[in-house]
Interface confidence: low
């Protein structure tokens, strides 16, 4: 399938002009290669009419141009002074020959319709209303006023001043006069449909002295806006229907032959195919709303329509807006697993892609919730503290520059199953959806920490060990100290990794962390994990409580689980100490309205990047005070 996309059908009238936009995939080669517009002949040949190399055919001389917009990955063909001879089949395309990548465009140029010379033309969109102005002479002021619609043989009454109304216009047509002006009457017709298009005559008085006026009402279906999106990316349908439908239920539907199947509406209807990857967001009181769909699939391509009606369903005679969505399969967005599986008590590491050109953008992870119109509350972000209920088990690791950040969630429960979104405050196309499935664990976890009930005594030495199976022998093992800004990796050195896999002794594979002497700041959550380069694997978590040794009893109550920790992990026996940077609470991230919730996802504000160290591997600073720390293998 060709990745070039444009309008399938273009219609115009003689003497007018058209502007045809064609889209191409975002690659350097495509931006610089030849663009062309050619006309298809009966023989199957496509004759070039204009190209970006400067070629212009004789029949287009002085009336056409082709402009490339590499920053938008589009090129535009403008053709003026159209004649009926321009009607035909064309291709817009890329390549050195006209057999390259292309898209078929049908152009139809009609004759200007013959109308009586005094005809007033009203052009309105479907669902809108029109007010027709009907002037008359003062002597016809007392006479009957009417509007009729011309049919083949006669003129069928629409409405008159005696309150007669054609059944098709009941509740839609009103005849009125303004103030004391006795020389003009008005007819307003609302909820316009295609059937309302045609010639009308308004009349005041009867017989030869009657005042008549010809009116041509054109009711247009909205021109579909073309949307060119990459596979796996996201799309936002911005729907602006006007204040008159501000209080009606809103919907987005996809055309399916004669009907339009509702995908989502504000009354809670949602197509199961879009579960976990769609939100509908009312924007304001003026009838504006947006629908965001992430994780675009091939089958999402098609003709979409938004509208408003109390039923939340498409209705004739109500305003609509339309789009033609093209899903480009030559996507720049990497093909990642869309389903991640974990087990209860275990962990998952989710690799989230982002636009590598935007490595300094703020990264977020949110959980999609389907209730109401759908929303996605942020759980963690590069400058968003972890939500309280995820304390000690969720962290975001940013790996600047490589186009991926990792979110790790451990201590899984079946309630964690659901849909999650990776997103940044930068390029919105890179929003991706992950479905997390959590099954009941059927075996022991790969990583185990001993002792499991870890209570360290102030001023004493405390060691915890993380046991791992031989299959992890070649991977890097790490301990990190969790805080609500990330999990700061503690420098470590794993002797186990130097053994050959043949001599791997299952019972001796462990990485230990020793606190010596234990301080109050050491209290908190610690993770033991494995990783290979920048690819994070399994983790397990342990909470270390710190208690004072007292005379009467062995321990006192542990302090707040959120206390900041000063934890070190060193090779062998080296006198030094490691502590985290000061953790000042960073206010909520601002790209989303409604606190931590992704609501107005369509217009995220760009944030200034603060100098937080969340998730960095070097979030510790060395202090000068000495302390013994042992790291055993």
């Amino acid at each position: 399938k060709s990745p070039i996309f444009g309008p399938q059908e273009v219609s115009s009238i003689e003497g007018d002009s058209v502007s045809i936009t064609c889209y191409y995939p975002d690659t350097s080669v495509n931006r610089h290669t030849r663009k062309y517009w050619c006309r298809q002949g009966a023989s199957g040949m496509c004759t070039t009419l204009i190209s970006s190399n400067g070629y212009l055919s004789k029949e287009y001389s002085g009336r056409a141009n082709l402009i490339n917009f590499p920053e938008n990955n589009t090129f535009v063909i403008n053709i003026e002074q159209l004649t009926q001879d321009d009607t035909g089949s064309y291709k817009c395309g890329l390549g050195t020959s006209n057999r390259g990548l292309s898209f078929d465009v049908s152009l139809e140029v009609s004759q200007v319709p013959e109308l009586p010379s005094d005809t007033h033309v009203y052009t309105k969109d479907i669902g809108r209303n029109v007010t027709i102005e009907c002037p008359f002479k003062r002597e016809n002021a007392p006479s009957k006023k009417s509007l009729c619609k011309k049919t083949n043989q006669s003129c069928e009454l629409v409405i008159d001043s005696t309150e007669k109304v054609n059944p098709s216009y009941i509740g839609r047509a009103k005849l009125f006069m303004k103030g004391t002006d006795l020389t003009v009457f008005y007819v307003n017709i609302s909820h316009l449909t295609h059937n309302d298009a045609g010639l009308y005559i308004c009349q005041a008085g009867e017989g030869p002295s009657a005042d008549k006026k010809n009116v041509d009402l054109q009711v247009l279906a909205p021109e579909p806006e073309l949307l060119y999106k990459d596979l796996r990316s996201s799309v936002t349908f911005e729907c602006d229907l006007g204040r008159e439908v501000a209080n009606e239920a809103k919907y987005l539907c996809r055309m399916n032959k004669e009907t339009c199947d509702v995908i989502i509406n504000t009354l809670g209807k949602r197509d199961p195919d879009f579960e976990g990857r769609i939100l509908i967001t009312p924007k304001d009181d003026n009838g504006r709303f947006s629908v965001l769909i992430t994780g675009l699939r091939k089958e999402d391509a098609g003709h979409y329509q938004c509208g408003a009606h109390s039923s939340g369903l498409p209705q004739e005679g109500w305003p609509i807006q339309t789009w033609q969505l093209f899903v480009n399969e030559e996507s720049t967005i990497p093909n990642r697993r869309s389903v991640v599986k974990g087990v209860t008590g275990g962990s998952v590491a989710i690799a989230c892609p982002y636009n590598p050109k935007e490595s300094s953008s703020l990264k977020y992870w949110c959980r999609w919730e389907g209730d109401g119109n759908g929303h996605c509350p942020v759980l963690v972000g590069t400058q968003a503290q972890v939500q309280e209920e995820y304390e000690g088990r969720l962290a975001l690791f940013d790996q600047p520059g490589n186009g991926t950040y990792t979110v790790i969630l451990n201590q899984l429960t079946t309630e964690d199953a659901g849909f999650y979104w990776c997103l940044t405050n930068g390029d919105s196309r890179w929003r991706t959806t992950i479905e997390l499935q959590v099954a009941e664990a059927t075996r022991e976890p790969n990583l185990e920490v001993t002792p499991q009930n870890a209570t360290a005594v102030l001023g004493e030495t405390f060691t915890v060990s993380c046991h791992y199976p031989c299959k992890f022998y070649s991977q890097e093992k790490y301990w990190c100290k969790w805080s609500n800004k990330g999990c700061h990796i503690l420098p470590s050195h794993d002797e186990g990794a130097r053994q050959s896999s043949v001599s791997c002794d299952q019972s001796s594979q462990l990485v230990s962390m020793t606190l010596n002497p234990v301080s109050k700041e050491d209290e908190g959550w610690y993770w033991c994990g494995v990783k290979q380069g920048q690819t994070y694997g399994e983790t397990t978590a342990i909470y270390i409580a710190v208690e004072e040794r007292t005379r009467g009893s062995s321990h006192v109550n542990p302090t707040d689980a959120n206390a900041r920790a000063k934890v070190a992990l060193e090779e062998e026996v080296v006198d030094s100490s490691i502590s985290e940077k000061e953790n000042k609470a960073i206010p909520n991230p601002g790209p989303f309205a409604n606190e931590r919730e992704i609501q107005n996802v369509g217009d995220q504000a760009q944030e200034n990047r603060a100098s937080g160290d969340a998730g960095s591997a070097d979030g510790q600073s060395r202090s000068s005070s000495s302390k013994h720390h042992h790291h055993h293998h």
């Epitope: 059944p167 009941i170 339009c260 209705q315 004739e316």
Partner: nanobody, 116 residues
Framework: QVQLVESGGGSVQPGGSLRLSCAAS????????IMWYRQPPGRQRELVAD????????TYTESVKGRFTVTRDNAKNTVYLQMSGLKPEDTAVYYC?????????WGQGTQVTVSS
């Protein structure tokens, strides 16, 4: 004065059929949006099906697709809901609704009970 009168409800065994009628006065059903709603016991009212003025598009809620059909008899100014393959979860009071001139009009409802 717009009036909608539903009839045709009753008790039926699972798998059975019923035809509900919605007779309208004060409006012309051929140019109105007519909707069938139902309210199962102790639950919220939900949209079952609708038919728009052109008659081109009829929308059915997922749970009734293929089993329920809406038809319209313009001469009798009546809209029908043909229900077949009835299930116990279809038990509800069924209401006819007309959307005309930006106003919603409701009938009094008719009870449908599906049980063995």
């Amino acid at each position: 004065q717009v009036q909608l009168v539903e009839s045709g409800g009753g008790s039926v065994q699972p798998g059975g059929s019923l035809r509900l009628s919605c007779a309208a006065s004060g409006i012309d059903v051929s140019i109105s949006t007519i909707m069938w709603y139902r309210q199962p016991p102790g639950r919220q009212r939900e949209l079952v099906a609708d038919v728009i003025p052109s008659g081109r598009s009829t929308t059915y809620t997922e749970s009734v697709k293929g089993r329920f059909t809406v038809t319209r008899d313009n001469a009798k100014n009546t809209v029908y809901l043909q229900m077949s393959g009835l299930k116990p979860e279809d038990t509800a009071v069924y209401y006819c609704n007309a959307f005309v001139r930006r106003e919603n009009y409701w009938g009094q409802g008719t009870q449908v009970t599906v049980s063995s």
